[in-house]
């Protein structure tokens, strides 16, 4: 029979023949040929191979390093590799997440947007007209103005971006 | 800083049963298998088992199946190896240490002394 | 279970003399370990994943091997080497220990 060009899912083509690939967690050690199967081992502790692979060796599991704010989100298998994720008050620097930053803070005048995860930064937005913020904080929204009028007071200080108006009670007419 | 700190020696009469202790600092147990060794005064290593902290799953070598027993608490970064019905044969160091490739050194504890006599 | 046999079991060599330490498995294994030890104190990681060298240790040390056969080698023997090092295996339960190769200085 003419020997195959393609090899059906989960093979692959090796001297005009196709063999197995080695399933995850395991990894080549010999090819097969026209009367053996291909050889496979099981990746050791601290290792993983996460796809079907004719790789003759595993890979090494990810190390979260405590020096650099990473910490385990969760261990590695044989066919899966260690997820790091970053210490309270930090995040990823990158998708792979090999090293993490403090959060960044939003300065007086700026509000949170959106609080920052263990791989995303904080984002912060200008405080809009009607809102501030007085505080450099990594957590804290714009507050609304305060209402005078609801207090049954006046404006006698406008507000800012960074600060809140201040109120005071209203001048009485004289007689 | 990684560190491994055992508890110290201990004197045990044979058929008594002694809980030895190994707290990690530097990282979260439960994020690492803890393996626990032998070694007999003047011998070689003997590598008696595995816990994984997280779950508590363990795998022992047969020959101390049913002698050892090893426990975790994450709440404290402690792992804990028991030997019971001891015997003069179980006068050994023992040893706490990592998955290899935490921080490319394998972390050990500084051992235990057990000693069985009567 | 996986029988690592180290070989030789003690052996003696001159400063700057080369040195190979070999651990032979039953059956293939993923990768080896190799530890040193000095007398009264803990074991400590040497090579893991066959070749690479544990953060410490000098560059006068490899390793090498594959399958069920592995060796540890000093291209030129130092005092400071002699020691007893040991191999493992962590691909199969039970892991085991070679026996030990004990080094020793001439």
């Known amino acids: 029979p003419e020997p195959p060009t393609a090899c059906r899912e989960k093979q692959y083509l090796i001297n005009s023949q196709c063999c197995s690939l080695c399933q995850p967690g395991q990894k080549l050690v010999s090819d097969c040929t026209e009367f053996t199967e291909t050889e496979c081992l099981p990746c050791g502790e601290s290792e993983f191979l996460d796809t079907w692979n004719r790789e003759t060796h595993c890979h090494q599991h990810k190390y979260c390093d405590p020096n650099l704010g990473l910490r385990v989100q969760q261990k590695g298998t044989s066919e899966t590799d260690t997820i790091c994720t970053c210490e309270e008050g930090w995040h990823c620097t990158s998708e792979a997440c090999e090293s993490c930053v403090l959060h960044r803070s939003c300065s007086p005048g700026f509000g949170v947007k959106q609080i920052a995860t263990g791989v995303s930064d904080t984002i912060c937005e200008p405080c809009p007209v009607g809102f501030f913020s007085n505080v450099s904080s990594a957590f804290e929204k714009c507050h609304p103005w305060t209402s005078c009028e609801t207090k049954d007071l006046v404006v006698q200080q406008a507000g800012t971006n960074k600060t809140d108006v201040v109120c005071g009670p209203q001048d009485r007419l004289r007689a | 800083e990684v560190q491994l700190v055992q508890s110290g020696a201990e004197v045990k009469k044979p058929g008594a049963t002694v809980k030895i202790s190994c707290t990690v600092s530097?990282?979260?147990?439960?994020?690492?298998?803890i393996h626990w060794v032998k070694q007999r005064p003047g011998k070689g290593l003997e590598w008696m088992g595995r816990?994984?902290?997280?779950?508590?799953?363990?795998k022992y070598d047969p020959k101390f199946q049913g002698k050892v027993t090893m426990t975790a608490d994450t709440s404290t970064d402690t792992a804990y190896m028991e030997l019971s019905s001891l015997r003069s044969e179980d006068t050994a160091v023992y040893y706490c240490?990592?998955?290899?490739?935490?921080?490319?050194?394998?972390?050990w504890g500084q051992g235990t002394t057990v000693t069985v006599s009567s | 279970q996986i029988v690592l046999t180290q070989s030789p079991t003690i052996m003696s060599a001159s400063p700057g003399e080369k040195v190979i330490i070999t651990c032979s498995a039953t059956?293939?294994?993923?990768?080896i370990l190799w530890f040193q030890q000095k007398p009264g104190t803990s074991p400590k990681l040497w090579i893991y994943?066959?070749?690479n060298l544990a953060s410490g240790v000098p560059a006068r040390f490899s390793g090498s091997g594959s399958g069920a056969s592995y060796s540890l080698t000093i291209s030129r023997m130092e005092a400071e080497d002699a020691a007893t090092y040991y191999c493992?295996?962590?691909?199969?339960?039970?892991?085991?220990f070679g026996g030990g190769t004990k080094l020793e200085i001439k």
């Open positions: 240490t990592t998955s290899y490739y935490v921080g490319t050194y394998g972390y």
């Open positions: 530097g990282f979260n147990i439960k994020d690492y298998y």
């Open positions: 816990i994984d902290p997280e779950d508590g799953d363990t």
């Open positions: 059956s293939s294994v993923s990768y």
């Open positions: 994943s066959t070749s």
């Open positions: 493992q295996q962590r691909t199969f339960y039970p892991y085991t």
